[in-house]
């Protein structure tokens, strides 16, 4: 039984491969799914010698490993691509790597938008 899940309607969107895939590079994504399916947000990125390279962000459809997560946290040690998911609108705006081996917690915040 699922209880009290945060409803996800919109996520931060980003696609590093936007030109090749002919999509927008960044913005907001409105999540659409089937009835009785939960919706989540996700972020994926690479870490090359401490430099964070964002791969994709957006909506992620019904994945039990994402249930009941308020924050986007990855804990895998050294994957080729880091992945995290969460529930709640725009919960993928910031994302965290919290390594199992007791290394430093690293949270990635979006840069502040420049005033117009």
């Amino acid at each position: 039984s699922g209880r009290g899940e945060a409803e996800t309607r919109e996520c931060i969107y980003y696609n590093a491969n936007w030109e090749l895939e002919r999509t927008n590079q960044s913005g907001l994504e409105r999540c659409e799914g089937e009835q009785d399916k939960r919706l989540h947000c996700y972020a994926s990125w690479r870490n090359s010698s401490g430099t964070i390279e964002l791969v994709k962000k957006g909506c992620w459809l019904d994945d039990f490993n994402c249930y009941d997560r308020q924050e986007c946290v990855a804990t895998e040690e050294n994957p080729q691509v880091y992945f995290c998911c969460c529930e709640g609108n725009f919960c993928n705006e910031r994302f965290t790597h919290l390594p199992e081996a007791g290394g430093p917690e690293v949270t990635y915040e979006p840069p502040p938008t420049a005033p117009t």
């Epitope: 039984s1 209880r3 899940e5 399916k37 490993n65 009941d68 946290v73 990855a74 804990t75 199992e100």
Partner: antibody
Amino acid sequence: EVQLLESGGGLVQPGGSLRLSCAASGFTFSNYAMAWVRQAPGKGLEWVSAISVTGGSTYYADSVKGRFTISRDNSKNTLYLQMNSLRAEDTAVYYCARHGSGTRAFDSWGQGTLVTVSS
Amino acid sequence: DIQMTQSPSSLSASVGDRVTITCRASQSISRHLNWYQQKPGKAPKLLIYEASTLQTGVPSRFSGSGSGTDFTLTISSLQPEDFATYYCQQSYSTPWTFGGGTKVEIK
């Protein structure tokens, strides 16, 4: 290295109870949903139950609903399966399995513990 | 519940053979289909997830394809360590269900 170690299996009479445990190590247990999958002797795999990262969402196969309860203690890195009103058809090897990150699959499994229900 | 039907239930093959196992879902499951390998007395091991993505560390001779209701696991050149039972599993909706298994035996 990811390790899942089940314990608590054994011989029990029909109508009896058992509690299985799965001790997890080598990964951040609290960041992964977990499941129990069973395999009757000489048969295929059957998903039994699953629990979300916080324990806030739990799901059961119809065959065990109302008799089995899944739970987790993230402070002890341990997954549990409380099995009540056991029947002969519950006889199986019970595996603890981890839900992979971004895979929608069981990416790590324990070696299993045998539960035998017989009089 | 979604029923998963695997075929064949068993097959005999030789080292170096190309082996194909099929899995059919009773309704569309998009690409939410996983493949596992199990050897006698051992726990299952994830080979392929989301129909075609190879799990880290799995040899490239294993491949998966399909979407909707029909899926295929292919072993391009069977090796001695590949003799085992293979299961498909849908992760589209609970209850998550497995196919009946395909036992790959030595000819």
